[in-house]
């Protein structure tokens, strides 16, 4: 089939990085500057994407592949091929389908990326909560309740009943 096709259509012999030039008896011509063809047999080359403004060049355009963009610091890509840039979330938030959402009670995120994770359950290790958790920080576990001086008490919050990374929409 390939051989038959190439007999019928000389353009099928043109490799990636070239185009089949109708103005020159269907000779395979190299893609002009700032253009590319990622597959063989193309009759035109595509214009290279330019990464401008909030978009930065991650990979330069070549004769066989388009440029790839990412986002300037403080932003991250959305969409196929980084078509949009979205502001990074704050600490204490996670990125959901609807954008940045505060961590639910009992979870935290100490970074500007990623998901909210449940606070450590100190009681699982036989310890007590020394410092309470926040949206931005995990709890700090201290000595086990038995190790505490008489009269001292500590409250260990129940482990949150949610899967890590799940956030109500």
């Amino acid at each position: 089939f390939e051989r038959t096709r190439s007999l019928q259509d000389p353009c099928s012999n043109c490799p990636a990085g070239t185009f089949c030039d109708n103005n020159r008896n269907q000779i395979c011509s190299p893609c002009p500057p700032n253009s590319f063809s990622s597959a063989g047999g193309q009759r035109t080359c595509d214009i290279c994407r330019q990464c401008k403004g909030v978009f930065r060049t991650r990979k330069e355009c070549s004769s066989t592949s388009n440029a790839e963009c990412d986002c300037t610091p403080g932003f991250h890509c959305l969409g196929a091929g980084c078509s949009m840039c979205e502001q990074d979330c704050k600490q204490g938030q996670e990125l959901t389908k609807k954008g940045c959402k505060d961590c639910c009670f009992g979870t935290f995120n100490d970074q500007k990326r990623g998901i909210c994770r449940p606070w450590t359950n100190c009681s699982l290790d036989g310890k007590s909560v020394l410092v309470n958790g926040t949206k931005e920080r995990d709890v700090v576990c201290g000595p086990s309740p038995a190790d505490l001086s008489p009269g001292a008490s500590s409250v260990t919050p129940p482990a949150p009943a949610r899967e890590p990374g799940h956030s109500p929409q």
């Epitope: 403004g53 909030v54 959305l78 949009m84």
Partner: antibody
């Protein structure tokens, strides 16, 4: 906070030019493309073009290509849109807007009235 | 150019109503669809970007959905401040193009 403040309303004669300014504050002006959108009375929104303040590179809507010039002065965080050979159907509100692949912040708009 | 067809062009609704506005693109825009609100004074505000992501400060009664060529903006319970004109806009290709707008009026 991020803000775009545009120049005031203009009344200009047919055949003349108008230059609208858009001053940005609250972010790094050079780091984001600025787009211009217009809206004729009672009509929808129409994209005119964009400028990358860092390089001065522009993309214009073919409809305005021969009449519009977009420039930017990074030293004063201001973008400009100049439209020449004005006609009565260029009467519209002109908006500047910051681009992230979506227009997250808009200027308040500048009404340009073309009238003899 | 990618054509954006918005419907309806206007609608009348009451406070508390659920309102749905649709936007159809002339070709696949791969979820690169944004929604804006324009109040009578002229101010334009971003509501939703990338089909379904709520812009900061926008109430959760606004939501977006869709894929390919068909997209929807929904207001789950219309509030007095929501009476305005809504525009969709594609960011898939230059030139950026907008729908014709939907004016939401008080019934």
């Amino acid at each position: 906070q991020v803000q775009l403040v545009q120049s005031g309303a203009e009344v200009v004669k047919p055949g003349a030019s108008v230059k609208v300014s858009c001053k940005a504050s609250g972010y790094t002006f050079a780091g984001f493309e600025m787009h211009w959108v217009r809206q004729a009375p009672g009509q929808g929104l129409g994209w005119m073009g964009a400028i990358d303040p860092k390089t001065g590179g522009t993309d214009y809507n073919q409809k305005f290509k021969d009449r519009v010039t977009m420039t930017a002065d990074t030293s004063i965080s201001t973008a400009y849109m100049e439209l020449s050979r004005l006609r009565s159907d260029d009467t519209a509100v002109y908006y500047c807007t910051r681009d992230l692949g979506y227009f997250d912040v808009w200027g308040q708009g500048t009404l340009v009235t073309v009238s003899s | 150019d990618i054509q954006m067809t918005q419907s309806p062009s206007s609608l009348s609704a009451s406070v508390g109503d659920r309102v749905t506005i649709t936007c159809r693109a002339s070709q696949d825009i791969r979820s690169n669809l944004n929604w804006y609100q324009q109040k009578p004074g002229g101010a334009v505000k971003l509501l939703i970007y990338y089909t379904s992501r709520l812009h900061s400060g926008v109430p959760s009664r606004f939501s977006g959905s869709g894929s390919g060529t068909d997209y929807t903006l929904t207001i789950s319970s219309l509030q007095p401040e929501d009476f305005a004109t809504y525009f969709c806009q594609q960011s898939e290709k230059l030139p950026r193009t907008f729908g014709g707008g939907t004016k939401v009026e008080i019934r």
